[in-house]
């Protein structure tokens, strides 16, 4: 197989014919050293998936349900290119499966038992697989056959294409369960009509269905969406209130050696030459000998799936939960309203040790999951492999963009017993220099910089945001002569100053000696000119408070703060000499786990929080000898957020704006994936 050949998998004679035409037309427009198409014919999409996994083919386009099959072991395929619909300016690559109800009804998602339901059709994604998959564990036992369990759950339904003889209740609202438009309640518009006519109480459809059927906003306002957290939202808030986000049609490839760049190069060229309204002789998104051959006829083009986006992230936690429930038919033994153990995400092995000790002391109420970077931990929380972790504000922003929510804030200044109910204003992000140097905020160019990590508040977002507005470009590695900013590209000058050890050099976790607040300060002490940290860092690591060899003899008066007006002040005056106020670190979780995480953590801190005085012979949640493991060591308590329960409200408008501006310079692959 030539290096630059993409072997496309076709699943019928008609697809194979179109594939050959695709191959021939691409040959005519691409240079001889460009990508080429070869065609491989298989009997089914599942056979194509297996062929790609076995390196007998390279690519195929799949519906969401098959993307799930492709991702499962031993296939391990991943999404590489997505079809989009709508316009190039506003490309739609996903749709949202929603539960629509009338505004004047008064039930929530957890009160659907005994209601009347309207479905698009048996076995269809938005109308059946997703809602029934998510409700699966609430269905009466035995749950097989599924249709019988659903019939016994709702008091009556319309499920087009169901067997009305065996399951008459599923056809109660549409006698005969007709499987075509002859049934007035068939498909998306039909299911919505079933609700509109008053036959059913809830309709399971796509987010766009209501807009396609009700042009008038006043009419739409008579309806609401049921959210998974047992609240309701208006129909235009579907991005924040849906059952699942479903990818429309996706090209998949091998996770390793999958030729994803070549596939993108090929499809990008293909859409330029043979996309919508591009060519008369061959059209990529048209199927003269059938329907949706190789690609959907309704597609308008392709978008490259960000490299950080694996199948789990692409399909989403809700979709995978629904499909897994349906396929595997397993439900937890515990009632669903009881909190299961919370899986904490620990960064690298130092945090894992502390988490393990916490787990033992919590009698298993806390379990531990590990990842090498904060972004990997956030991804694990998104896909359900972990449940929660505490994050710096910069990562609260990324987590929020990825659909996670803040649950509790770390408080640093409020003494107990008021701590748990107090919303603190935040801490100061400062620039620290040695008293002996002549540095000011205005002459940092060419100096050596020390940062907590890329993407963190005090160490990166605030100082680099301020710097960006001064220099108007993102080449921070050219502004400083060298530095240590863990998480930077390994060959960047901003990794040059890092201490490692070697394989962990510049990694954004505690294996890198200059990571975090203490690490950045150590970098200043040993090699750097300026450290970007929190205002408490110098006092916490001087005067013998940090017993480590590098810190035990340090004096607070040997360090000063840089003020934005070009002056310098004592480290005792952060209120009058700081770069900005930073939001406190916060615990984040998935929405569905937020209440359990909050309840458990408040309970845990009563046992292991700052009320424990002897940490040498007791487990202390907020102690790790200046290393800020799992939580900042200066945490007094975890505090309730009250109404600051979204990332925007928690971080505040000003900080969100600053980080959004800095996104031009973003090196966050996760943020790129979450905003796809």
């Amino acid at each position: 197989v030539p290096e630059k050949s993409v072997r496309w998998c076709a699943v019928s004679e008609h697809e194979a014919t179109k594939c050959q035409s695709f191959r021939d037309h691409m040959k005519s427009v691409l240079p001889s050293n460009g990508p080429s198409v070869a065609c491989v014919k298989k009997a089914s999409h599942l056979d194509c998936i297996r062929a790609i996994a076995a390196n007998e083919a390279d690519a195929v386009t799949l519906d969401a349900g098959l993307v799930y099959d492709a991702y499962l072991a031993p296939n391990n395929l991943k999404p590489v290119v997505a079809e989009f619909y709508g316009s190039k300016e506003d490309p739609q690559t996903f749709y949202y499966a929603v539960a629509v109800v009338k505004k004047d009804s008064d039930f929530q998602m957890n009160q659907l038992r005994g209601r009347k339901s309207c479905h698009t059709g048996l076995g269809r994604s938005a109308g059946w697989n997703i809602p029934i998959g998510l409700l699966y564990c609430d269905l009466p036992e035995p749950r097989k056959p599924l249709e019988k369990a659903v019939a016994n759950f709702f008091s009556g339904s319309c499920v087009p294409c169901a067997d009305g003889t065996d399951f008459p209740q599923l056809c109660q609202l549409c006698p005969g369960c007709g499987c075509s438009t002859l049934n007035q309640y068939f498909s998306y518009s039909g299911a919505f009509k079933c609700l509109k006519d008053g036959a059913g109480d809830v309709a399971f459809v796509k987010h766009s269905t209501i807009f396609e059927n009700l042009a008038n906003k006043a009419d739409r306002d008579q309806y609401e969406l049921l959210c998974l957290d047992n609240t309701r939202k208006s129909v235009d808030e579907y991005k924040d209130c849906h059952l699942a986000r479903v990818p429309s049609h996706t090209v998949v490839a091998r996770s390793v050696g999958g030729k994803e760049d070549l596939i993108w190069e090929l499809l990008n060229q293909a859409q330029e030459h043979f996309g919508k309204d591009k060519s008369k002789e061959f059209q990529l998104f048209s199927s003269p000998h059938g329907k949706d051959l190789l690609f959907k006829d309704s597609a308008h083009g392709f978008l490259k799936v960000p490299p950080r986006m694996d199948a789990k992230m692409y399909l989403g936690y809700e979709y995978i939960t629904a499909i897994r429930n349906l396929r595997e038919g397993t439900c937890p033994e515990a009632p669903t309203d009881e909190c299961k153990p919370v899986k904490w995400c620990a960064l690298s092995h130092h945090e894992r040790l502390k988490c393990d000790e916490w787990s033992v002391n919590s009698a298993g109420k806390i379990e531990c999951e590990s990842a090498e970077t904060t972004e990997d931990c956030i991804a694990k929380i998104m896909n359900g492999e972990a449940d929660a972790m505490s994050l710096d504000g910069g990562f609260v922003y990324i987590a929020g963009m990825c659909g996670l929510v803040p649950v509790l804030a770390e408080n640093y200044n409020t003494p107990n017993p008021n701590c748990e109910n107090t919303a603190e204003e935040g801490y100061f992000a400062v620039a620290v220099v040695k008293s002996s140097s002549d540095l000011t905020w205005d002459n940092l160019k060419g100096k050596k910089s020390c940062h907590t990590a890329v993407g963190r508040t005090a160490g990166w977002n605030i100082p680099m945001g301020l710097l960006y507005s001064k220099i108007n470009h993102c080449r921070f590695d050219e502004f400083f002569s060298e530095g240590c900013a863990p998480g930077s590209e390994k060959n960047s000058s901003l990794c040059k100053l890092c201490m490692g050890p070697s394989p962990n050099l510049c990694e954004p976790n505690n294996k890198e000696g200059y990571y975090g607040y203490t690490g950045a300060f150590r970098c200043l002490v040993e090699k750097g000119d300026v450290a970007f940290v929190k205002h408490q860092t110098v006092p916490q690591n001087t005067g013998g408070k940090n017993p480590d060899a590098w810190a035990k003899n340090l004096k607070e008066e040997d360090y000063e703060l840089l003020c934005l007006d070009g002056s310098r002040k004592s480290v005792q005056e952060p209120a009058n000499c700081h770069l900005a106020r930073a939001p406190n670190h916060a615990v984040v979780a998935r929405k569905d786990k937020a209440d359990c995480v909050q309840t458990l953590l408040l309970d845990q801190q009563r046992m292991f929080g700052s009320s424990v005085t002897d940490c040498s012979s007791n487990f202390c949640l907020f102690e790790s000898k200046t290393k800020d493991l799992l939580f900042r060591d200066d945490t007094v308590c975890l505090a309730k957020l009250h109404d600051r329960n979204t990332y925007e409200k928690y971080l505040g408008e000003e900080y969100v704006k600053a980080v959004t501006n800095l996104r031009k310079c973003s090196t966050s692959p996760l943020l790129e994936a979450c905003t796809f």
Partner: nanobody
């Protein structure tokens, strides 16, 4: 600082039993949490079982019902009773008391357990 020395490992057939001991050089009465970890070739070190001073225990899912952790403060010893051993239990087993903080790498020699027919 208390030193810990593991022993009791060996070669055992699937279904067999072993009892690991971890002897401390000083008093463990004031040590809150003690634990057994294991590391198989090419794998990360993982928590097998832990016990607090008050006797609260936690086990990895893979060993629940087969392994039992206990401590004898009078003898300054931590134990791990391993029954119904499986080939996948093959690893070097280490004990720790977390008392040196989480940051230093302070593992002892460990004791090798091999489960094979």
């Amino acid at each position: 600082e208390v030193q810990l020395v593991e022993c009791g490992g060996g070669l055992v057939q699937p279904g067999g039993s072993l009892r690991l001991s971890c002897a401390a050089s000083g008093s463990i009465a004031s040590i809150n949490t003690m634990a057994w970890y294991r590391q198989a070739p090419g794998q990360q070190r993982e928590l097998v079982a832990g016990i607090t001073r008050g006797g609260s225990t936690k086990y990895a899912d893979s060993v629940k019902g087969r392994f039992t952790i206990s401590r004898d403060n009078a003898k300054n010893t931590l134990y791990l009773q391993m029954n119904s051993l499986k080939p996948e239990d093959t690893a070097v087993y280490y004990c720790t008391d977390y008392s040196r903080g989480y940051y230093q790498d302070y593992w002892g020699q460990g004791t090798q357990v091999t489960v094979s027919s």
